[in-house]
């Protein structure tokens, strides 16, 4: 709990806490945190963890708290909670946090990772699926194919992470991706490393040819060596009785 | 610079009414309340009430109430303060001032008020 | 409403002195508490806010304390544009209340 006044949960409720237009924004936007109570309050505070006095505190009469926060910076980026007071309760009490809103104030969203599912190596006629994986929820994943200047597949996803299923003929490839806020206005992430998908192994493939080959000659002497052994054994037994080897 | 012009000093007659304005500059003006302070010759200060220009909500001090009416013009940034039923104990310098989010005031420069027959 | 007793009411001082102003509320206030400078003829001007936050462009020589219901004013050392006027302004409840006010004079 965030003051050690706080009642019970069911006595004082704890308000909601929401951000326009995003809870990730660039430098520079006008962010309004919106902190809405279950019944009229007098006052909203928002709280960043461990504070047991509110950072930015607004007076209303009603059940909602608007913050204006005018061109934020990163710095005023971070963990949130909003509570309440109203003038009938005891000096310093105040509601039940909201649940905690992250605000993330950035440039640019941390690059995110891209592997294949099972594995880079497509096997004839098998599909694969691509995992773009970055660190937020709710964000819109974009997946690109080299050579391709225009986006190969989207996806919004509520995890931090979107799959992008290929069809196995058309999935060798080099393929990058991002992620980027839903909504304006846009953050975007850097582009992941590159991953390259191709057919099993050529190479290997030889390999495998080759081998059978090998092994269908090793076969055939084999044949060729038996059918003589028998062809000899069998004339030794048909020759005159006196003459032996 | 976040600046409060107020309306420049008043003589009004007992009964009459008035109107006192404090145009906001500096900062978005409906991003923040806006407070209304009394100050009677050579005495301390008293709070009358605010208006969040955002939704024209306010709040008054109970000793206030009925006396001073809060209102906002948004396209002008501007509050008004309107006192009715004038009498000598109303005679006093009446202050504007900007609460932020951290617990900053800022002051306008006051407007006086002189209730005279 | 929450009563706001400042003390003193008055006081001289000495260019240079340190010099220490209280206001004790009726109740707590969880340290929303100004302090606040007038002088002759002009409007208040806030130097401290939350107990114990300078105001942008304030002396350093000007300093908050306290919590609860009991806080502090000091100037560590007067000058002569010192002298005016000092409130004390409590904002934890409704209606907000000032405290009678120091008039601090040079000696």
């Known amino acids: 709990d965030i003051t050690p006044s706080v009642p019970p949960a069911s006595y004082h409720p704890k308000p909601w806490l929401g951000a326009q237009p995003a809870t990730v924004v660039t430098p520079g936007v006008n962010v309004t945190l919106r902190c809405r109570a279950p019944q009229p309050a007098w006052r909203f505070g928002l709280f960043k963890p461990g504070e047991i006095a509110p950072l930015l505190f607004r007076d209303v009469s009603s059940e909602l708290a608007e913050f204006f926060l005018e061109e934020v910076t990163p710095a005023q980026g971070g963990s949130y909670r909003c509570c309440y007071r109203r003038p009938d309760w005891g000096p310093g009490v105040w509601s039940q946090p909201s649940d905690v809103l992250e605000l993330l104030v950035t440039e640019e969203l941390p690059r995110p990772s891209l592997v294949a599912l099972p594995g880079p190596v497509v096997g004839p006629g098998a599909n694969v699926s691509l995992r773009c994986a970055g660190r937020l929820r709710n964000m819109s994943f974009v997946l690109y194919r080299e050579g391709v200047a225009a986006p190969l597949q989207y996806r919004h996803s509520a995890q931090p992470w979107a799959d992008f299923t290929l069809l196995g003929a058309r999935a060798p490839g080099t393929y990058s991706c991002y992620y980027h806020t839903p909504s304006a206005p846009y953050v975007l992430s850097q582009r992941s490393e590159v991953l390259v998908i191709s057919w099993e192994d050529s190479g290997s493939s030889d390999y495998t040819r080759g081998n059978l080959v090998r092994l269908g000659l090793a076969g055939l002497v084999l044949i060729s060596l038996g059918a003589l052994v028998t062809f000899d054994w069998r004339s030794q037994n048909r020759a005159p009785a006196g003459i032996r080897p | 610079e976040i600046q409060l012009q107020q309306s420049g000093p008043e003589l009004v007659k007992p009964g009459a009414s008035v109107k006192v304005s404090c145009k906001a500059s500096?900062?978005?003006?409906?991003?923040?309340?806006m407070y209304w302070v009394k100050q009677s010759h050579g005495k301390s200060l008293e709070w009358i009430g605010y208006?969040?220009?955002?939704?024209?909500?306010?709040r008054y001090n109970q000793k206030f109430k009925g006396k001073a009416t809060l209102t906002v013009d948004k396209s002008s940034s501007t509050a008004y303060m309107h006192l009715n039923s004038l009498t000598s104990e109303d005679s006093a310098v009446y202050y504007c001032?900007?609460?932020?989010?951290?617990?900053?005031?800022?002051w306008g420069q006051g407007t006086t008020l002189t209730v005279s027959s | 409403d929450i009563k706001m007793t400042q003390s003193p009411s008055s006081m001289y001082a000495s260019l240079g002195e340190r010099v220490t102003i209280t206001c004790k509320a009726s109740?707590?206030?969880?340290?929303?508490l100004s302090w606040l400078q007038q002088k002759p003829g002009k409007s208040p001007k806030t130097l401290i806010y939350?107990?114990?936050r300078l105001v942008d462009g304030v002396p350093s020589r000007f300093s908050g304390s306290g919590s609860g219901q009991d806080y502090s004013l000091t100037i560590s050392s007067l000058e002569y544009e010192d002298m005016g006027i000092y409130y004390c302004l409590q904002y934890d409840d409704f209606p907000y209340t000032f405290g009678g006010g120091t008039k601090l004079e040079i000696k």
């Open positions: 109740q707590d206030i969880n340290s929303f």
């Open positions: 500096g900062y978005v003006f409906t991003s923040y309340n």
């Open positions: 208006i969040d220009p955002y939704n024209g909500g306010t």
């Open positions: 939350r107990a114990n």
């Open positions: 001032a900007r609460l932020d989010y951290y617990g900053n005031f800022y």
